[in-house]
Interface confidence: low
């Protein structure tokens, strides 16, 4: 067969769907690989062909579009399952071609089972809500295109196993779930079950997402450097190990990059010749505020090192701060014999 632009197996798009539920899967070629859409391709005389490789098999085979009740069908650039079965799991390929052009991509589709509490191996999207922040809503995800706007589905929301009704601060509003005031106790998995009729059959769509309540931007502050501070002096003799922790608190900020770094005499440690190591540890609060600690370590400090300026810097979307460590050379305790000699010399 003639050459075909093969984009390989697109593992970035690991598609997971629930068993015994409808699934509509768009050919990724038009979304991620090609610069034109399906309509343009179709009007240019290109044909979209689907085939698949079953789980644990190597053989590519055509998809059977002649199953009872049109269980699997194709509509434009969408592959439909009404509904899925467990053994539909495999790698699916869509190929766009005519006599002179060919492009194809494969993607994995996994049909997963869920229990009566909606637990499953499905990777769940995480939706972050700001704590005590006014009304915030989550929307039942990935249900567009399953039924026309003339169809009015019924939507039931669950937290874990429990149907949400008469909850204090959580109100189901159709496709939306409103949190009047988000609290830590609202952390958890939320499931919407959308039920709709189609051609005399009833289908269910189950969508679960994880809600994580995080620090509110109203309470966000610039980074706070707890250490080094004015109360601690790092007093060392040459030859000793110098350890200076830089401990910084960062308020949670959506999409903020938190950074901590040391400078020694105004330069990054990598840019100077002294043998310095830096170890970092990170911890998080329940609302995803972050504490970062970077320990600067010089195994055998010299008297020159003890004269340098050691500054801890921190930056987030709220601002940048810096704090110098107080480092000094320990004055050696006076030695008795030397003192006596000086004494005799003075008389």
């Amino acid at each position: 067969s003639e050459r075909c632009d093969d984009w390989g197996l697109d593992t970035m798009r690991q598609i997971q769907v629930f068993e015994d539920e409808p699934a509509r899967i768009k050919c990724p070629l038009f979304e991620h690989f090609l610069k034109f859409n399906y309509s343009t391709a179709h009007s240019a005389g290109l044909t979209l062909i689907w085939y698949w490789t079953r789980q644990d098999r190597d053989l590519e085979e055509p998809i059977n579009f002649r199953l009872p009740e049109n269980r699997i069908s194709k509509e434009k650039d969408v592959l439909w399952f009404r509904p899925t079965l467990l053994n539909d799991t495999g790698n699916y390929t869509c190929m766009l071609r005519n006599t002179t052009y060919c492009s194809k991509v494969a993607f994995p589709l996994e049909v997963v089972q869920k229990d009566s509490c909606f637990n499953s191996p499905m990777k769940l999207p995480v939706h972050k809500l700001y704590i005590e922040y006014g009304i915030q809503r989550i929307t039942c995800p990935n249900v567009d295109g399953y039924f026309p706007s003339s169809v009015k589905p019924t939507i039931t929301w669950y937290m874990g196993c429990y149907k949400i009704q008469n909850f204090n601060n959580v109100i189901p509003e159709g496709m939306n779930l409103s949190f009047l005031i988000a609290l830590i106790s609202n952390n958890g998995n939320y499931t919407c079950v959308v039920t709709y009729p189609e051609n005399g059959r009833t289908f269910h769509l189950t969508r679960t997402l994880t809600v994580k309540v995080v620090g509110s931007p109203k309470n966000a502050v610039p980074p706070v450097i707890h250490s080094p501070n004015d109360h601690v002096v790092y007093e060392k003799e040459p030859g000793e190990e110098l350890l200076i922790p830089c401990t910084v608190y960062f308020s949670f900020l959506m999409d903020s990059r938190n950074e901590v770094w040391w400078t020694i005499d105004g330069k990054k440690p990598d840019d100077i010749t002294i043998d310095v190591t830096i170890n970092e540890s990170i911890s998080h609060s329940r609302t995803e505020d972050e504490t970062r600690t970077q320990i600067l370590s010089i195994k055998k400090v010299t008297s020159e090192d003890l004269k340098r300026s050691y500054v801890c810097h921190a930056r987030s979307a709220k601002g940048e701060v810096a704090k110098a460590a107080k480092v000094k050379q320990k004055v050696p305790a006076p030695r008795y014999t030397v003192e006596l000699a000086c004494g005799f010399g003075a008389t």
Epitope: G134, L180, I181, N219
Partner: antibody, heavy 120, light 108 residues
Framework: EVQLEESGGRLVQPGTSLRLSCAVS????????MSWVRQAPGKGLEWVST???????AYASWPKGRFTISKTNSKNTLYLQMNSLRAEDTAVYFC??????????????WGQGTLVTVSS | DVQMTQSPSSLSASVGDRVTITCQAS??????LSWYQQKPGQAPKLLIY???DLESGVPSRFSGSGSGTDFTLTISSLQPEDFATYYC??????????FGQGTKVVIK
């Protein structure tokens, strides 16, 4: 109908105190963040203070402790206590409801305002 | 605190004109910006939130754009009822609340 109605504005002397009220109807004060905004005659809008659902408060830097925002959820009423009033506090004071959605704190619903005049 | 600078402070325009008002923040406020319209003797009215989202009920001739420090309110075709004063407002985190000084749109 959802609405906000301010009251309590009047002519007062410098150095005195005044409490403004904002009666809300059509929604519960316990479900929304609320703000006070003022507008001096012929001037622009100036944010004064906000009280969040949980009762946390925030103020502009200029009142310097003279103003206090509070609310009584059971009465569905928002307040602004203004002490040590000055001539420059003369303004129409609006209460406003924050949008409460999508994390964007826009002032989506406003009262008609109440006029405070500070003059000797 | 964030300072908001609006320009121009006033502009004269005719019905049907395309009108652009700009607002600059003294530091990045991401997309945390609102636009309001105020007519004499009335309370302000929210037009745009989140820099570009149209408040429900607001005509589509109003649009907002920008993020970070530079923002724009555009009225694509000025109508008689649009002659008013327009304000931008920062809604960013602790500093939210700061308004621009206003832009008065008057009939040419």
């Amino acid at each position: 109908e959802v609405q906000l109605e301010e009251s309590g504005g009047r002519l007062v002397q410098p150095g005195t105190s005044l409490r403004l009220s904002c009666a809300v109807s059509g929604f519960s004060l316990s479900s929304y963040d609320m703000s006070w905004v003022r507008q001096a005659p012929g001037k622009g809008l100036e944010w004064v203070s906000t009280i969040y659902i949980g009762g946390t408060t925030a103020y502009a830097s200029w009142p310097k402790g003279r103003f206090t925002i509070s609310k009584t959820n059971s009465k569905n009423t928002l307040y602004l206590q203004m002490n040590s009033l000055r001539a420059e506090d003369t303004a129409v004071y609006f209460c406003a409801r924050l949008q409460g959605a999508n994390y964007y704190n826009s002032l989506a619903l406003w009262g008609q305002g109440t006029l405070v005049t500070v003059s000797s | 605190d964030v300072q908001m600078t609006q320009s121009p402070s006033s502009l004269s325009a005719s019905v049907g004109d395309r009108v652009t008002i700009t607002c600059q923040a003294s530091q990045s406020i991401y997309s945390f910006l609102s636009w309001y319209q105020q007519k004499p003797g009335q309370a302000p009215k929210l037009l745009i939130y989140a820099a570009s989202d149209l408040e429900s009920g607001v005509p589509s001739r109003f649009s907002g754009s920008g993020s970070g420090t530079d923002f724009t309110l555009t009225i694509s075709s000025l109508q008689p009822e649009d002659f008013a004063t327009y304000y931008c407002q920062s809604n960013y985190i602790i500093d939210y609340g700061a308004f621009g000084q206003g832009t008065k749109v008057v009939i040419k």
